[in-house]
Interface confidence: medium
């Protein structure tokens, strides 16, 4: 899923889910002056970034598991 780096929303596409084993960390960006949407940006173990759909139940479980592991940025 593509990520842009302007002062606006970063995610142009989102994935409904991704294998937890591929994720190194997750950054949950709350809505604010940069973007009026919650954005979930996963950094993968291969160094790439992927945007995940914050409304997806699978993504919510992933966030919960990673937060519990304490490996968020």
């Amino acid at each position: 899923a593509s990520v842009v780096t302007e002062l606006r929303c970063q995610c142009l596409q989102t994935l409904q889910g991704i294998h937890l084993k591929n994720i190194q960390s997750v950054n949950v960006r709350s809505p604010g002056p940069h973007c009026a949407q919650t954005e979930v940006i996963a950094t993968l173990k291969n160094g790439k970034k992927a945007c995940l759909n914050p409304a997806s139940p699978m993504v919510q479980k992933i966030i919960e598991k990673i937060l519990n592991k304490g490996s968020t940025n």
Epitope: L12, P31, G32, A36
Partner: antibody, heavy 116, light 107 residues
Framework: QVQLKESGPVLVAPSQSLSITCSVS????????VHWVRQPPGQGLEWLGV???????NYNSALMSRLSISKDNSKSQVFLKMNSLQTDDTAMYYC??????????WGQGTLVTVSA | NIVMTQSPKSMSMSVGERVTLSCKAS??????VSWYQQKPEQSPKLMIY???NRNTGVPDRFTGSGSATDFTLTISSVQAEDLADYYC?????????FGAGTKLELK
């Protein structure tokens, strides 16, 4: 249950200013943002601006010079102030909450009429 | 500013028919499009967010789809209570903008 209620209705003379209060309950304005949107009679929706949990704001650039949004977290109230009103500012003014996405819940709106 | 263009401006349908409303963005807005229903003398109500996510309590006959610049709201079998104006809106960049709306009327 999230509820929003705008003060009003309001009659404003041309060139005068407008103040509306949005009272929120069921969620915290210290956690989520609150947007203001207006709708002229028989027309579509126009976004005015938003105040975020931390107090920062974004405005519609077309109206920014006339607009101010502020809040009082202790009273769970959000304020819209607009000056130099003209007849084409006559509209229904709504406040709406931010959640993960904007405009999740809306107030019932308040009619602002600009007339001499 | 991103311009959201809705079509048609109005449509007249019979109960049970399938309805497709279109919304086009003037530039790529990803999936940051929502759909709102506004009944006469009422506030707008969020129906679909993130292009395809149905809001809580919205009947499953309402489906949102699309990404980038082309978005669709489909009502699989229109009911009398669906008579309303429907607006799309983008939240990808400021200022947030809405389409001019589609009025859904019943025959």
């Amino acid at each position: 249950q999230v509820q929003l209620k705008e003060s009003g209705p309001v009659l404003v003379a041309p060139s005068q200013s407008l103040s509306i209060t949005c009272s929120v309950s069921g969620f915290s304005s210290t956690t989520y943002g609150v947007h203001w949107v207006r709708q002229p009679p028989g027309q579509g929706l126009e976004w005015l601006g938003v105040i975020w949990a931390g107090g920062s704001t974004n405005y519609n650039s077309a109206l920014m010079s006339r607009l101010s949004i502020s809040k009082d977290n202790s009273k769970s109230q959000v304020f819209l102030k607009m000056n130099s009103l003209q007849t084409d500012d006559t509209a229904m003014y709504y406040c709406a909450t931010q959640y993960h996405y904007p405009f999740a819940y809306w107030g019932q709106g308040t009619l602002v009429t600009v007339s001499a | 500013n991103i311009v959201m263009t809705q079509s048609p401006k109005s449509m007249s349908m019979s109960v049970g028919e399938r309805v497709t409303l279109s919304c086009k963005a003037s530039e790529n807005v990803g999936i940051y499009v929502s759909w709102y229903q506004q009944k006469p003398e009422q506030s707008p109500k969020l129906m679909i967010y993130g292009a395809s996510n149905r809001n809580t309590g919205v009947p499953d006959r309402f489906t949102g789809s699309g990404s980038a610049t082309d978005f669709t709201l489909t009502i699989s079998s229109v009911q009398a209570e669906d008579l309303a104006d429907y607006y799309c809106g983008q939240s990808y960049s400021y200022p947030l903008t809405f389409g001019a709306g589609t009025k859904l009327e019943l025959k």
